[in-house]
Structures are given as structure tokens and as C-alpha cells.
């Protein structure tokens, strides 16, 4: 849960109460125990962008 008064995190990131900042949900694949990963499960990651047409 995001701390009161904090701006919402951008898509693909989630609020970390342990660090007092938004953290990239991509890191949860490597370390799923991080506190912010709970918020990542609720919000889908940023849409995948192809690097070529």
C-alpha cells in the first residue's frame, strides 16, 4: 500500500515502504520477496515495446 501523500508510481513500478520510493517491478522476477512486489502483482507491467517494426 502506498504511503499517504505520495504521488502514484508510474506504470510498471510500485511503492516500496522499505525504501520510501517507487521501484521497478521488473526486479521482482529476480527478488520476489521485496516489499513492493506485492503491489506489482496487482498492477500489470508496462506494455512490451518492440525495438523494431
Amino acid at each position: 500500500e502506498q504511503a499517504p501523500g505520495q504521488a502514484p508510481c508510474s506504470r510498471g513500478s510500485s511503492w516500496s515502504a522499505d525504501l520510501d520510493k517507487c521501484m521497478d517491478c521488473a526486479s521482482c522476477r529476480a527478488r520476489p520477496h521485496s516489499d513492493f512486489c506485492l503491489g506489482c502483482a496487482a498492477a500489470p507491467p508496462a506494455p512490451f515495446r518492440l525495438l523494431w517494426p
Epitope: 504511503a3 515502504a17 522499505d18 525504501l19 520510501d20 529476480a30 527478488r31 520477496h33 521485496s34 516489499d35
Partner: antibody
Framework: EVQLLESGGGLVQPGGSLRLSCAAS????????MMWVRQAPGKGLEWVSY????????HYADSVKGRFTISRDNSKNTLYLQMNSLRAEDTAVYYC?????????????WGQGTLVTVSS | DIQMTQSPSSLSASVGDRVTITCRAS??????LNWYQQKPGKAPKLLIY???SLQSGVPSRFSGSGSGTDFTLTISSLQPEDFATYYC??????????FGQGTKVEIK
């Protein structure tokens, strides 16, 4: 130069209390998570407690949960550890350490330590 | 909690020797492994973070490698100031941070 200076250690009887302090200087204290780590005489390192930059989130090792309380005063650049119901097995050198700026990744600066002896 | 096991617990070496210390985690910790050096009566000092990244100011003779469960700290050419105790530490299973039991490097 980053400096962390612990104080407040000493001899205390079992069941007693102590409050450790860690004064930080040489860096902006408020953005960094902080930790306490201890080392019993002749033994290895044991993580004790963690506090988030704002102080809103805290974590404790099972061995101290319910007895120790970590806190910080960012206006005074100081970290604290309130230790209650002390036991002989809490005898150790207590270090404060600065956390990395990502997520619990490492302790990059440590204080010199303060010795806590619990004995009757 | 994840258990960290270092080997050997102590070793004797001479100045100029190549020294290798290993650290094994009880489960995979990816690359969330740090190494510290501690001299008697002093605070630990960060040497290596994220398994292989050298902390600023640490001599290049120190290097780290490994991922998953097996990690290595290597001192390529031991110097007199390197005689100390070395600890590994995992930062994967937060907040249950754990250290290895330490490896004491002594003069032969």
C-alpha cells in the same frame, strides 16, 4: 567523509534496558535506509534491525523482535536502538551501518561499534 | 532464513599467494551476494557487492564471482594488509539478511 559514530553501550543487568545512538555525518542522512548489526565476542556478524529512510518501515531479526525498537531522527542525523529485556546472549559489539540506495543490497559504511555487555 | 556457509573457516597463506574463499547459499540467491573484510577490533568493510562489483576504493586484486548458490572471493596476490576475516552476506531474502560464519586468513 562519511562517518557513523555509535554510543550508549555499557554494562547492564539481565532484564535491563539500554539505548544506543548512531550519529551520522559527511552525507545526507535522510535518503538512506539504516541498519544495526551485532557481533558477539569471537563470533560472526548478525543482522539486528532495519529502518527505512522516513522511519515508517522497520524490520527485526527474530532474536530481538518484541524487545528492540529501531528509530531515527532525520533532523538530528541520528539512528537509535532501544534495547529492552536484555539477555546474556545480547552481549555483543553493536554496529550501525548505512544501507545501499537500492533495496537492502549492501552495507557500504559502518560505525566503529559500541560494546553492550549483559551480565549480573 | 537462507543459510550461508563459507569454506574454509580459516586458512594460512603467504604474501603473494592467490587466495580463494567460497560461500554457498542454502538456496538460489541470484547475484545478491556481498563480501566484507574485517580486521580485529575494527568494523567490517564492504569489498564486493552484487557478487562481482568492486566497491569504490577497494584494490583490484580483490574479485568476486558466482551466481545462484555458489560464490567465490579471490585475492589475486595477498598483501600484508589483507590478513583479516572475510564474510559473505546474502541480500536476496529481505529483510532476513544473513552472513556467512567468516573465513580467517592468517599468515603462514
Amino acid at each position: 567523509e562519511v562517518q557513523l559514530l555509535e554510543s550508549g553501550g555499557g554494562l547492564v543487568q539481565p532484564g535491563g534496558s539500554l539505548r544506543l545512538s548512531c550519529a551520522a555525518s559527511g552525507f545526507t542522512f535522510s535518503p538512506y535506509p539504516m541498519m544495526w548489526v551485532r557481533q558477539a565476542p569471537g563470533k560472526g556478524l548478525e543482522w539486528v534491525s532495519y529502518i527505512s529512510p522516513s522511519g515508517g518501515s522497520t524490520h527485526y531479526a527474530d532474536s530481538v523482535k518484541g524487545r528492540f525498537t529501531i528509530s531515527r531522527d532525520n533532523s538530528k542525523n541520528t539512528l537509535y536502538l532501544q534495547m529492552n529485556s536484555l539477555r546474556a546472549e545480547d552481549t555483543a559489539v553493536y554496529y550501525c551501518a548505512r544501507g545501499g540506495d537500492t533495496y537492502f543490497d549492501y552495507f557500504d559504511y559502518w560505525g566503529q561499534g559500541t560494546l553492550v555487555t549483559v551480565s549480573s | 532464513d537462507i543459510q550461508m556457509t563459507q569454506s574454509p573457516s580459516s586458512l594460512s597463506a603467504s604474501v603473494g599467494d592467490r587466495v580463494t574463499i567460497t560461500c554457498r547459499a542454502s538456496q538460489s540467491i541470484s547475484s545478491y551476494l556481498n563480501w566484507y573484510q574485517q580486521k580485529p577490533g575494527k568494523a567490517p568493510k564492504l569489498l564486493i557487492y552484487a557478487a562481482s562489483s568492486l566497491q569504490s576504493g577497494v584494490p583490484s586484486r580483490f574479485s568476486g564471482s558466482g551466481s545462484g548458490t555458489d560464490f567465490t572471493l579471490t585475492i589475486s596476490s595477498l598483501q600484508p594488509e589483507d590478513f583479516a576475516t572475510y564474510y559473505c552476506q546474502q541480500s536476496y531474502s529481505t529483510p532476513g539478511i544473513t552472513f556467512g560464519q567468516g573465513t580467517k586468513v592468517e599468515i603462514k
